[in-house]
């Protein structure tokens, strides 16, 4: 019994599963895209690919009222090691530049789906 | 929109140099990896070089090995290529392009030509 409530105990979500889900969040997202996405909404692009998790949240905790990525938001929020607030700025951004939502969506699946192929987890 | 915009080209006599330059705009540059391509007249498209999103590798022709050298400046969302010791035989239209193996991340620029006259 001891053995079975161990396994019926959630637990921590291993990193590998959480980046995969959160792949499978970005490809629901493209794929089921009809009307431009958060109303054709601008975010800070990135120019690093360290730190890119609490970065990409940075550019996307941003858009509001958008429940199509308020799911991607919540799941990037479990990567990123400290609390991000609306109109923060990180030195991971191309000021003054700014990408729709969608595409930057598409390029954070892109990056993901490498991440996921080099065994980068966390 | 997504924008790949390169400069540089021009003539220039066997043996010179030129630096090409490619400004991305419209998207994550920093995730993509990147390469120049180029299409000599009556001519097939040849990758010239390729560099991976954070720069880490690059990868280079056999015609072009140990005279050009590919590098990215992500801050600034600009690829740049840079042609020393040009023969005849590079003259062409060189293209900045992403460099993904899935092509629903594929886009090209317009394209700069590179003369090498004799």
């Known amino acids: 019994l001891t053995c079975l409530g161990g396994f019926a105990s959630p637990g921590p979500v291993p990193p590998s599963t959480a980046l995969r889900e959160l792949i499978e969040e970005l490809v629901n997202i493209t794929q089921n895209q009809k009307a431009p996405l958060c109303n054709g909404s601008m975010v800070w692009s990135i120019n690093l690919t360290a730190g890119m998790y609490c970065a990409a949240l940075e550019s996307l905790i941003n858009v509001s009222g958008c429940s199509a990525i308020e799911k991607t938001q919540r799941m990037l929020s479990g990567f990123c090691p400290h609390k991000v607030s609306a109109g923060q700025f990180s030195s991971l951004h191309v000021r003054d530049t700014k990408i729709e939502v969608a595409q930057f969506v598409k390029d954070l699946l892109l990056h993901l789906k490498k991440l996921f192929r080099e065994g980068q987890f966390n | 929109g997504v924008q790949l915009l390169e400069s540089g080209g021009g003539l220039v006599q066997p043996g010179g140099s030129l630096r090409l330059s490619c400004a991305a705009s419209?998207?994550?540059?920093?995730?993509?990896?990147m390469g120049w391509a180029r299409q000599a007249p009556g001519k097939g498209l040849e990758w010239v070089s390729r560099?991976?999103?954070?720069?880490?590798?690059?990868y280079y022709a056999d015609s072009v090995k140990g005279r050009f050298t590919i590098s990215r400046d992500n801050s600034k969302n600009t690829l740049y290529l840079q042609m020393n010791s040009l023969r005849a035989e590079d003259t062409a239209v060189y293209y900045c392009a992403t460099a993904e193996r899935d092509d629903t991340f594929d886009y090209w620029g317009q394209g700069t030509l590179v003369t090498v006259l004799e």
């Open positions: 560099i991976k999103d954070w720069g880490w590798a690059t």
């Open positions: 419209g998207f994550t540059f920093a995730w993509y990896d």
